[in-house]
Interface confidence: low
Amino acid sequence: GYKAEVMVSQVYSGSLRVLNRHFSQDLTRRESSAFRSETAKAQKMLKELITSTRLGTYYNSSSVYSFGEGPLTCFFWFILQIPEHRRLMLSPEVVQALLVEELLSTVNSSAAVPYRAEYEVDPEGLVILEASVKDIAALNSTLGCYRYSYVGQGQVLRLKGPDHLASSCLWHLQGPKDLMLKLRLEWTLAECRDRLAMYDVAGPLEKRLITSVYGCSRQEPVVEVLASGAIMAVVWKKGLHSYYDPFVLSVQPVVFQACEVNLTLDNRLDSQGVLSTPYFPSYYSPQTHCSWHLTVPSLDYGLALWFDAYALRRQKYDLPCTQGQWTIQNRRLCGLRILQPYAERIPVVATAGITINFTSQISLTGPGVRVHYGLYNQSDPCPGEFLCSVNGLCVPACDGVKDCPNGLDERNCVCRATFQCKEDSTCISLPKVCDGQPDCLNGSDEEQCQEGVPCGTFTFQCEDRSCVKKPNPQCDGRPDCRDGSDEEHCDCGLQGPSSRIVGGAVSSEGEWPWQASLQVRGRHICGGALIADRWVITAAHCFQEDSMASTVLWTVFLGKVWQNSRWPGEVSFKVSRLLLHPYHEEDSHDYDVALLQLDHPVVRSAAVRPVCLPARSHFFEPGLHCWITGWGALREGGPISNALQKVDVQLIPQDLCSEVYRYQVTPRMLCAGYRKGKKDACQGDSGGPLVCKALSGRWFLAGLVSWGLGCGRPNYFGVYTRITGVISWIQQVVT
């Protein structure tokens, strides 16, 4: 029998340029008579143009919703009712071609063409894009609060805030033809629920979304977004009612930045430079295409790309990359934002060099990407360390901590976290190495103690990049490095002349001169430790709440013992800068470390001195008794202590602690306490120091109070931020 043809609605959005009309400010106001009359004429012209082609039989409806510069640009949408089987045949490209063909056919025609009665339409200025009914609904919901702005070259235009009586607003932005728009969003309130979506076209087309941001993000207080060209739309959706704009928007046109480079690398094994997407740290734009060609000096080397908070992953070929597509040596990889470092190692097999392409495969983009590049030795990629194939990083091997996510760095270890004697592969504890007493059968633990050795997991790296065999040689009063750098920066870790954490005891003045009390409006919130003349280290989670993120709130007290009274050795500081570790993750407590820059340098005294910072290779041996200090609660759920408490805790092997906490313990964490509980940190101790005394009598910072289950509970140890796991970031900031 006869089967009715199934018809579907196909929505198109677009713009066209009118050469014999000029844009005026009146056309930005939808309520003006100029806007109404121009819309009526443009709408008529658009309908006539469509119906002049073979698309006319499918015409359903159309609307001109806005105007812009150039001399006059009309922005519109229209709907065609198409037989389902023909839908793919009427793609936006096909529809555009049909309309352009129609326009070209009448350019020199003397015949009266209805759509040319008033308008001279530029065939080259016609753009047709795919849209949806949902897009049109989204557009219509903003028309009560629709703002058009043209921004000229060299201008930075601050956009007027949204109309708070509306629930949604749209800023339609346009710039000079051959430039691209850069939008800057700055959140101005601590908290909000607003949503902003940026599009690479004049209206809210879902398929052309560049990015959307929610709430007043503290992680990204400022966001810069690049469009692929001179047109952009920003849609605001109201969150909580507020009389204050929770954000400031500004826009400027910028020139296209070439993203192509040819480089020849030097014969050395470290970072040699940086590659980045245009206008980094701005979001990369849709249609970004970068091509970097790197030439390697010899086939002994491979090329390493070190990423920060971004990784490359293989993706099934048919799936698009949502966070950037990379092709390296004809291998397709997808970018992925992560809160970890990552390296991609590229073996070199030909002297022709390596081409790296980065492409934004879809209109959805993300923060600009930056990568450090350098060489590695193909035969020994990680001298003295283990190459973690999961993330391309060199990690310490057999040190008792699973640094590699798959744990292979701790597999097949003859001696874990100990020294392996050459003679018979017996294992001796690290403090026995180079201590002047032979412990191995033929004394191999005491060999090469006065000379440089290949760098490895437990060797100390001197400033001249050479390594020494003696473990933990820092500040022990004996120069072990040729350049003496192991004895530099040693004005630290000494207690003053000394006359409650759970299970603790009261400390005396000057006993823990690095201890800090971090206070808000006179109330102790967290502990911390002085590590340099102007820097205090603490836990990032102390600043988790938005209300705690402002430096002006905080006062740092040093030399303090009693919370309710002052004594002459006590000093207070304001905070000039607060830096959270860029990889800090609230949920997992990973990288739980923050640095506070004091408003002025400390004047050292018996009561105020920094603690020593360990080198990355410093080994804090499980079983070692160390101390935690703070004004935290003396029992779970109790009030904070008036007196500075101290308590000894034992360092716990990582695998044991990891088991207790169901494998939530990362390599940036360290556990301390006792099986039976009792002695532990508690609320209010957060950020405070876990310190261990070296043989030299100096105290080294091993950890920061981070998290744990309750306080002093049996079988649940305290979990601390492992300082050796974050030391490179600390040093980078402090120096």
Epitope: R158, R521, T551, V552, T555, K574, R577
Partner: antibody, heavy 118, light 107 residues
Framework: QVQLQQPGAELAKPGASVKMSCKAS????????ITWVKQRPGQDLEWIGN????????YYNEKFKSKATLTVDTSSRTAYMQLSSLTSADSAVYYC???????????WGQGTSVTVSS | DIKMTQSPSSMYASLGERVTITCKAS??????LSWFQQKPGKSPKTLIY???RLVDGVPSRVSGSGSGQDYSLTISSLEYEDVGIYFC?????????FGAGTKLELK
Amino acid sequence: QVQLQQPGAELAKPGASVKMSCKASGYTFTSYWITWVKQRPGQDLEWIGNIYPGSGSTYYNEKFKSKATLTVDTSSRTAYMQLSSLTSADSAVYYCAPYDSDYAMDYWGQGTSVTVSS
Amino acid sequence: DIKMTQSPSSMYASLGERVTITCKASQDINNYLSWFQQKPGKSPKTLIYRANRLVDGVPSRVSGSGSGQDYSLTISSLEYEDVGIYFCLQYDEFPLTFGAGTKLELK
């Protein structure tokens, strides 16, 4: 609304001290710093220091450390600045203002004109 | 200390003219910059904070822009009441430091 009341003028002899006041109203006094600024006739502005009424914590410009002492009385919502060992170089208008790390000084007192003369 | 270099030190402009004053910091001040206007015998009046945010009640012809070390204050169309001395202030770091001021007078 936010207001800061300062006495209009103070006269003092060289070598003496002067203590000026700044009474705040219209906002939570203990939650914002009070900042003090000096302006000599026809000259630019110089920051003297800040005091945080919530804790009494102070921060001084090195240049004014031995010259100015900042204090507060939270019960009367008043901040004070004492200038000691006065010389003619201390003749100036001194302003107080609430200070916030985001807005800096968005309200200012009317200023106290100090004249040091024998 | 962060040094703020303000220019010009003085300028003449006509009513309706566009006026721009600049301040350069000796290091990146992360947009922590305020602009003040002062009239003879009066206390300073804050116009802009965080480099580009207008204080309530300040006319929209006044705007601030810039980032990093370079900042500017623009009056799009000068009016009689805009005459006075303009100062910038960095408050990214203690000690707070001011620019030396720009005296704006009518031509």
